[in-house]
Each structure stands twice: as C-alpha cells, then as structure tokens.
C-alpha cells in the first residue's frame, strides 16, 4: 500500500495495535454539496423493479435511522404496466459502516460495525440451475 | 427520542458538546454472518440496467477502497437484448458514513464524513418537464 509520513501534530494514542481505539470527531463533514437532497427518492416508484422503504431504527447505533428497500414484486414491470414474472426484481445490497455504542448506552464510546443494507431494487434476468 | 440511562462503566469524556470527539474501536464487528459473500456481485451483468464497478481509493479515508457503480447505457436492455432508449438506466445513490483522517496522515484521529456513492443502477420511466 501507500506509505504516508505521520503528521507530527497527531494526537497521542496509547494503543498502537489492532483492535485499536481511535478518536473520531462526530461533527459530520458532508461532501455532497453539489447534490439535490431529493436525489433518488422517487426511483422507488418509477423503476421497473419498484420498492418500498422501511425505517430501521436503533438508538444504540449511529446513524440511528437507516432506510431499507424491499422490492414490491417478484417480477418486473413491463411496458404495459403489468408485472412480468419472467424477470425478477432483486435488492441491490451494500455493506456500510455504522457505529455501535460499546459498552451499551455509552454516549462517547463506539465500535465500528459492518452491516448489509438494501438500497434499492434492479430488474434481472433469472438464472436457473438444474440440480438433478 | 428514546432516553437511555447512561451505563456507569462508560469511559470518561471531557467534551460533552458537539462537535464531540468519541472513542471508536476499529476492530470491525461484521453482523452479516448469514450472507453469501457473492451477494449482488453478478447483478451488474444480469440487470436490465447493467453497470460497471470502478475502484475509488483514498488512503486518507477509512475504508480506503470504495466501489462506485457507473451505468453502462443511457437506456435499458429490453426483452430482445437490445438497448431501449425510451427508458433510462440511472444510478441508485446512497449516503454513507466514512472516517476521514484529521489532521491528515494521522493514524488515530478521524472525523466522520458523509459521502454519496452509486451502488448500482435501476431502470426508470423518464419524466419530462416542459420549461418554456
């Protein structure tokens, strides 16, 4: 990998080994300055593989609210507006990092956690494997 | 919101105000124990709105590698396997949290950052607004 010289102005850290504890500033910097907050919010209705959004709330997690997509149909919407069951609506999943309060209920101590979330749905050609 | 009693075993924190600095254990806990590592990895080819995945690497960010989806076509693949340009392939975007080294090049000091990533593509019916 790329070796970067350590900045002499870095805060001290007692534990240099993994699992390592680091200092994190929770004042979020948002790099999405050039995007409309509406973003992809209407795709869930306009897509040929539409989905519903479900609110997942967990006060022990940061962010505490995550929206999960659930495909509306097994098939995909065709040109006539009907569901075509020769195609499949499937969720696009992504692994994201969240902060989990550890020990529980502590406001200033977290552990990184990887969770899988469904972001939206896409229409795919089904693959069938003959097993016998 | 939900008020949770503070755990008496929590680490001390000097700064109780935002922007607040918290302790984060980087030993990632993966809750996706029951998922296939392949997950949606082949959807990018099988979708009616296929996409390519581009590697975005930044050593000052954690995670340092993020994969970005770029739709292959302006239109969507129809039942005949041709691209239908009356429909649109569009990227499904999601805001995710990452850690940004701050000050730069420091191994143990980070700031939370929100970035927008394209996770995959979906096929939508275009909407046209007449502006004049």
């Amino acid at each position: 990998g790329i070796t970067i010289p350590r900045n002499p102005g870095c805060p001290n850290s007692e534990d240099k080994n993994f699992p390592r504890t680091v200092m994190v500033n929770l004042n979020i910097h948002n790099r999405n300055t050039n995007t409309n907050p509406k973003r992809s919010s209407d795709y869930y209705n306009r897509s040929t593989s539409p989905w519903n959004l479900h609110r997942n709330e967990d006060p022990e997690r940061y962010p505490s609210v995550i929206w999960e997509a659930k495909c509306r149909h097994l098939g995909c919407i065709n040109a006539d507006g009907n569901v075509d069951y020769h195609m499949n609506s499937v969720p696009i999943q992504q692994e994201i990092l969240v902060l989990r309060r550890e020990p529980p209920h502590c406001p200033n101590s977290f552990r990184l956690e990887k969770i899988l979330v469904s972001v939206g749905c896409t229409c795919v050609t089904p693959i069938v494997h003959h097993v016998a | 919101g939900i008020t949770i009693p503070r755990n008496p075993g929590c680490p001390n924190s000097e700064d109780k105000n935002f922007p607040r600095t918290v302790m984060v254990n980087l030993n990632i806990h993966n809750r996706n124990t029951n998922t296939n590592p392949k997950r949606s990895s082949d959807y990018y080819n099988r979708s009616t709105s296929p996409w390519n995945l581009h590697r975005n690497e930044d050593p000052e960010r954690y995670p340092s590698v993020i994969w970005e989806a770029k739709c292959r076509h302006l239109g969507c693949i129809n039942a005949d396997g041709n691209v239908d340009y009356h429909m649109n392939s569009v990227p499904i975007q999601q805001e995710i949290l990452v850690l940004r080294r701050e000050p730069p090049h420091c191994p143990n000091s980070f700031r939370l950052e929100k970035i927008l990533v394209s996770v995959g593509c979906t096929c939508v019916t275009p909407i046209v607004h007449h502006v004049a």
Epitope: N34, T35, N36, K38, R39, S40, D42, Y43, R46 | K70, C71, N88, V90, P91, Q93, S118, V124, T125, P126, I127, V128, H129, H130, V131
Partner: nanobody, 122 residues
C-alpha cells in the same frame, strides 16, 4: 427561468453532417448533466446522448455511437451535437434537455420543447 434554445437543424443528404447547438440560461449550466433527445415522426422521445457536468463522461445510443459527438462549453452555457454520416433514420426533431436535479443523472428532465428539425433525404 430555465431556457433551452436549439438551433442548427436543416435538410441534409445521407452521409452529410450537421452541428446542433443549444443555448442554455436560467440555471447553473456547469452543474447539470445535459442531453440530446430526439423524436421521429409518430414515435416517442429517444434519449440519444448525455454529457456529465464537467464534460468527461458521455453516453451515446447504439444507433448514433461513432457518428455523433456531444460536447459542451461551460463558460458560454452551450451544448453541442456534432452529427456525421447522417442516415435517413436520423430524421427527427432534436431537443436539448437538462437533468431536473443537480449533479447526476436521475431520468427526470427539463426541456424547452421547440427543438430543431433534422431531415436526412436525397
């Protein structure tokens, strides 16, 4: 107020060339994806080309790929479509459109609606 005004169409023989222009105003042109859309007689709108805000990322319909080139001048708020090796099936009204949302492609568009007629005939 968003305004998109197309020009440059006309009658051309098969194999000929045309350069379409679109003058944009009323929005921050350099922040939006821009598109060329065409409508052949009796057909629906067909998205034939798209160009990212910075100009580095372009899309083309298979039917025009290799013959048409989309470009933009962000300083002058102009979008172009260079059309070479024109065919009779390219006959249509050509419209310039902008994405409805800033920054990326959403499949939602604003267009001026006047268009410029391109007729390819011998």
């Amino acid at each position: 107020e968003v305004q998109l005004v197309e020009s440059g169409g006309g009658l051309v023989q098969p194999g000929g060339s045309l350069r379409l222009s679109c003058a944009a105003s009323g929005f921050t042109f350099s922040s939006y994806w821009m598109y060329w859309v065409r409508q052949a007689p009796g057909k629906g709108l067909e998205w034939i080309s798209a160009l990212a805000p910075g100009g580095g990322n372009a899309y083309y319909a298979d039917s025009v790929n290799g013959r048409f080139t989309i470009s933009r001048d962000n300083a002058e708020n102009l979008l172009y479509l260079q059309m070479n090796s024109l065919k009779s099936e390219d006959t249509a009204v050509y419209y310039c459109a902008k994405d409805h949302n800033v920054g990326y492609r959403t499949g939602e568009y604003d267009y001026g609606g006047q268009g410029t007629q391109v007729t390819v005939s011998s």
